[in-house]
């Protein structure tokens, strides 16, 4: 969508304006995070055979990972900018607990996992500035998140490896869907 003059457009000669429009910045930020996820997935797939496993359904039952659905207004059919933006922000906020879980799951990529977490927080801030209807965004309950984290960390090794793989795969898919939707806004 075109940027209204004086907001974030490149032709505004403000002394300290951002070097990118907000839409460009969001697009690049998502791809930056996807780049980080692919580095983490590489370690996960090298370390275990989870990436080829057919037993994903077993672990998926423990998880309630955000997914795009038709009603969210992010797909081409039935596209709704405001509903979709709320879904993207809500979904990212819901992913935060899972990104926190990833923090202790990597030996050689500890900082990489932190990088994905931190760049996601920045993305949420960018998107919140774009959203008009912030009241519609529900923030996850911290107590619920804390007990979910405890539950995930108490799983056996196989389930923890599978959970890590599923989080990364789902987060990648969610970001890719978000990217496609945001390019229509």
């Amino acid at each position: 969508a075109p940027v209204p003059p004086g907001e974030d457009s490149k032709d505004v000669a403000a002394p300290h304006r951002q070097p990118l429009t907000s839409s460009e910045r969001i697009d690049k930020q998502i791809r930056y995070i996807l780049d980080g996820i692919s580095a983490l997935r590489k370690e996960t797939c090298n370390k275990s055979n989870m990436c080829e496993s057919s037993k994903e359904a077993l672990a998926e039952n423990n998880l309630n990972l955000p997914k795009m659905a038709e009603k969210d207004g992010c797909f081409q059919s039935g596209f709704n900018e405001e509903t979709c933006l709320v879904k993207i922000i809500t979904g990212l906020l819901e992913f935060e607990v899972y990104l926190e879980y990833l923090q202790n799951r990597f030996e050689s990529s500890e900082e990489q996992a932190r990088a994905v977490q931190m760049s996601t927080k920045v993305l949420i801030q960018f998107l919140q500035k774009k959203a008009k209807n912030l009241d519609a965004i529900t923030t996850p309950d911290p107590t619920t998140n804390a007990s979910l984290l405890t539950k995930l960390q108490a799983q056996n090794q196989w389930l923890q490896d599978m959970t890590t793989h599923l989080i990364l795969r789902s987060f990648k898919e969610f970001l890719q869907s978000s990217l496609r939707a945001l390019r229509q806004m």
Epitope: Y32, G36, A115, V122
Partner: nanobody, 129 residues
């Protein structure tokens, strides 16, 4: 732990050139963002330029951004073999005189100093008229 060390500062004539270097060690993550900032006495740090780096060849890799005041005069680049990010400063002006810092973050497309996590100790640039 990530460490950044700047070098290449010094005295230059107006209209002259300097090349600043920032050696990065201890980085274990990708993608990453490196920025150059300048600070004049008694003033706040100002963003100068940014480059995005990645260990994978994506189209984000090597993405560069410049403050209006230096665009067309300064060039930011990186040399992965030497873990170095350079700032080539041409057509220098007296108002470019400042301490120049390089900084690193993995937060993405950020351009303000409070969003950077690791900092070098700075190198002084003085431009005489």
């Amino acid at each position: 732990q990530v460490q950044l060390v700047e070098s290449g500062g010094g005295l230059a004539q107006a209209g002259g050139s300097l090349r600043l270097s920032c050696v990065v060690s201890g980085r274990t993550f990708s993608p990453y963002t490196i920025g150059w900032f300048s600070q004049r006495p008694g003033k706040e740090r100002e963003w100068v330029a940014t480059i995005i780096g990645s260990d994978r060849s994506t189209d984000l890799d090597g993405d560069t951004y410049y403050a209006d005041s230096v665009r067309g005069r300064f060039t930011i680049s990186r040399n992965d073999a030497k873990n170095t990010v350079s700032l080539q400063m041409n057509s220098l002006k007296p108002e470019d005189s400042a301490v120049y810092y390089c900084a690193l973050t993995a937060k993405g497309y950020v351009f303000t100093d409070n969003e950077y996590d690791y900092w070098g100790q700075g190198t002084q640039v003085t431009v005489s008229s």
